[in-house]
């Protein structure tokens, strides 16, 4: 059947529409389009003769219509008047006619809407506001948006006039928002610019800040008043009922007890005509003295002396507070407070007790802090350290040793070589050393205040020949898949290259092997039983080389899943059962047996003479490695047959 499809059905003014013909019959002479629902010569738009491919305009032709060979009609630059029905008249070669009708609707492209308001400055809880979306447009739908959201459900919001008017009853400050209207028709949608509703409100009851009402004599009083209000409120201050000034802030420097009283802030909104007030009572107190700390020992000795710190002055009915390192006092048996908290005693001071210490006096208003006090704790000297750590030097180089010991006051240093005093300096320097400079180098550190001395001795060897190195280890019995082992090649020597061998071979490439500390340290991560090898380190310089004795790594592992032998599981009655259990483990594991869950003996071999069918069951071997803390087990089923019934099995020995 011949049909007409309008593409699109809803057309915007100025756009175009195609009346698309479906199921056009064969063998046609021509066709003609008419405006309306019937064939009417006065309303012919255009005709088309297929044989000549000639289009002919009719009385209703507007110059905007184009006919296609497939009979479809294009109408361009659509106007409102084009709305309606269109009829296609098809003339077949046999002169039998066929008709079909299509239609479309024309809508205007909507203009950008705008919002008009009946009240530009509504007063909160009093006024209503009506917004109207302009212009009024036929066949348009009106929508409203508040802060780009669709309208909330509220009994105070009402839509009327075909949704063109939005009324807000009894406006509140929360209605201060961005309002937009939108017009829609089938061909377009346009949104207005936003209109911000300016709701007049307040003033609310003002708040006076800061909240504290107690002040010390000599302080500055700085009060600020704020009341929610639109437009912003105008402020006035009254003290004890007397007007002071028309400002939001009230400032009185260097107050005295006479400034105590009632302070009133009044907020006024000139647009709403409303006033609100808030009163605060200010009390000014005479100022207490600033506290300070006294000490019974200004230079206490570490681990020997106690120190008592006292907060001055002594004031009756006063709370004393203490701080160490700007924190409240830590809980410690070495810290003791007197009953009134005025004295803080540090028992057996340490170098970490230096402070700073502060005390405070609490009064009605605040806490007065003392200046900080730092304790000068005398300590040390600790055992001195000599650097660098090298013990072997080659002839001809310079020897430069430095000594340091933690000490207060700083230590005085002396150097001795083979017991003979050399010099009283922190550093010892000997140029162009020879083998004769080998010996015992002693650094002595002395604290003049405590009278304590400490020494450290270092053996220095000057030799062209490197010594035989040795390997130290941080873990003599590492556990497989758990521990790491760090081997270090000793001694540390200047200008020396360190080398490593495993089982006489150079180090294999492995992500578990890592060299560090100038190749002096070899670390094995996540050791395995395969790492139980001979490790040798070597040192060399330009004139000599030497190798350590091998160190064999003793890796603890296992026990692995045990194996029970022989593998046979079927036996003849009267045979001897001799089961042996073995598990790979270092050190060797402890063995135990269970038959049908019942503990037997703690041996590696289980022997039962002349077994019978009563010996049928599950035989479990349990292994345990006390060093690794790991266990393992295996279960074997044994079947004993009466003599002569076993299918060709030999008796177990």
């Amino acid at each position: 059947k011949l049909t007409i499809e309008s593409t699109p059905f809803n057309v915007a003014e100025g756009k175009e529409v195609l009346l698309l013909v479906h199921n056009l019959p064969q063998h046609l002479f021509g066709y003609s389009w008419y405006k309306g629902e019937r064939v009417d010569g006065n309303r012919q738009i255009i005709g088309y003769v297929i044989g000549t491919q000639q289009a002919t305009p009719g009385p209703a032709y507007s110059g905007r219509e184009i006919i296609y060979p497939n009979a479809s009609l294009l109408i361009q630059n659509i106007i409102q008047n084009d709305t309606g029905f269109y009829t296609l008249h098809v003339i077949k070669s046999d002169l039998v006619n066929e008709e079909a009708t299509g239609q479309f609707r024309v809508y205007p492209e909507l203009p950008k809407p705008s919002i008009s308001s009946n009240n530009s400055k509504p007063v909160e809880d009093k006024d209503a506001v009506a917004f109207t979306c302009e212009p009024e447009t036929q066949d348009a739908t009106y929508l409203w948006w508040v802060n780009n959201q669709s309208l909330p459900v509220s009994p105070r919001l009402q839509l009327s006039n075909g949704n063109r008017t939005l009324t807000l009853f009894n406006v509140t400050r929360n209605d201060t928002a961005s309002y937009k209207c939108e017009t829609q028709n089938p061909v377009s949608a346009r949104r207005s610019d936003s209109v911000i509703l300016n709701v007049l409100y307040g003033p609310d009851a003002p708040t006076i800040s800061p909240l504290n009402t107690s002040y010390r004599s000599g302080e500055n009083l700085n009060l600020s008043c704020h009341a929610a209000s639109n437009p912003p409120a105008q402020y006035s201050w009254f003290v004890n009922g007397t007007f002071q000034q028309s400002t939001q802030e009230l400032f009185i420097p260097n107050i005295t007890v006479n400034n105590s009283g009632s302070y009133t802030c009044q907020a006024h909104n000139s647009d709403t005509g409303l006033n609100r007030t808030t009163v605060t009572t200010i009390t000014v107190y005479a100022e207490p003295p600033k506290p300070f700390i006294t000490s019974n020992n200004s230079n206490p000795v570490e681990d020997e002396d106690a120190v008592a710190l006292t907060c001055e002055p002594e004031i009756q009915n006063t709370t004393y507070l203490w701080w160490v390192n700007n924190q409240s006092l830590p809980v410690s048996p070495r810290l003791q407070l007197s009953n009134d908290n005025r004295t803080l005693t540090l028992l057996s001071v340490t170098r970490n007790d230096v402070g700073p210490y502060e005390c405070g006096i609490q009064n009605e208003l605040s806490v007065d802090h003392s200046d900080p006090v730092i304790l000068n704790v005398l300590y040390g000297p600790d055992d001195p350290t000599i650097s660098p750590s090298y013990t072997y030097y080659r002839p001809g180089v310079n020897l430069s040793l430095s000594c340091h010991a933690a000490s207060n006051p700083p230590a005085q240093y002396s150097w001795l070589i083979d017991g003979n005093i050399q010099q009283h300096t922190q550093e010892l320097f000997i140029s162009n050393i020879t083998e004769k400079n080998s010996g015992l180098y002693t650094c002595q550190a002395n604290n003049s205040a405590s009278g304590h001395s400490r020494t450290t001795v270092k053996t220095i060897t000057v030799s062209a020949e490197l010594p035989k190195p040795s390997i130290s280890s941080n873990n003599s019995k590492p556990v497989e898949d758990k521990d790491a082992v760090a081997f270090t090649c000793e001694p540390e020597a200047q200008n020396t290259t360190y080398l490593w061998w495993v089982n006489g071979q150079s180090l294999p490439v492995s992500p578990r092997l890592q060299l560090s500390n100038g190749n002096r340290t070899l670390t094995l991560f996540n050791v395995t039983r395969n790492d139980a090898r001979a490790y040798v380190c070597g040192i060399q310089n330009s004139v000599s080389a030497n190798r350590s004795d091998p160190v064999t790594l003793d890796v603890l592992y296992g026990p692995d899943t045990p194996i029970i032998s022989p593998p046979d599981s079927s036996y003849l009655s009267g045979a001897n059962l001799n089961l042996s259990c073995h598990s790979a483990s270092n050190p060797s594991p402890q063995y135990s047996w269970r038959i049908n869950g019942i503990p037997q003996q703690h041996t590696q071999v289980l022997f039962i003479a002349k077994i019978t069918p009563n010996n049928n069951g599950t035989y479990a071997c349990f292994v345990s490695n006390l060093a690794t803390g790991r266990n393992n087990s295996i279960v074997k089923s044994i079947t004993v047959s009466a003599s002569g019934t076993s299918p060709g099995l030999s008796a177990g020995a």
Partner: nanobody, 119 residues
């Protein structure tokens, strides 16, 4: 009555110029798209240029780009085709047509005007 009447054709030497006119009646050319179609023996019919006054757009066939200019005077309800640098291959009957702005399909029913380019 709707009519399109073409004029301005003639004989011109290669490199010469001609200006064709299309007087429309029965409708306003400002509301639609007008174009020029040419027909030459043994050649395919070709839409050489079109103008849509309501959108302000013009289109040209590659073969005439830079040589032909289409214009329309809405007060006279007339469209024009200024043809410069004419070539022998521009010889044809030129028809004024109503053109689809999108796909360039056209309907015409004027008598046409003949342009002959020859030395």
């Amino acid at each position: 009555e709707v009519q399109l009447v073409e004029s301005g054709g003639g004989l011109v030497q290669p490199g010469g110029s001609l200006r064709l006119s299309c007087a429309a009646s029965g409708f306003n050319i400002k509301d639609t798209c007008i174009g020029w179609v040419r027909r030459a023996p043994g050649k395919e019919e070709e839409l050489v240029a079109s103008i849509c006054k309501y959108t302000g757009k013009t289109r040209y066939a590659d073969s005439v780009k830079g040589r032909f200019t289409i214009s329309a005077d809405t007060s006279k309800n007339t469209a024009y085709l200024q043809m410069n640098s004419l070539r022998a291959e521009d010889t044809a009957v030129y028809y004024c047509a109503i053109v689809a702005s999108g796909d360039g399909w056209y309907n015409y029913w004027g008598q046409g005007t003949t342009v002959t380019v020859s030395s």
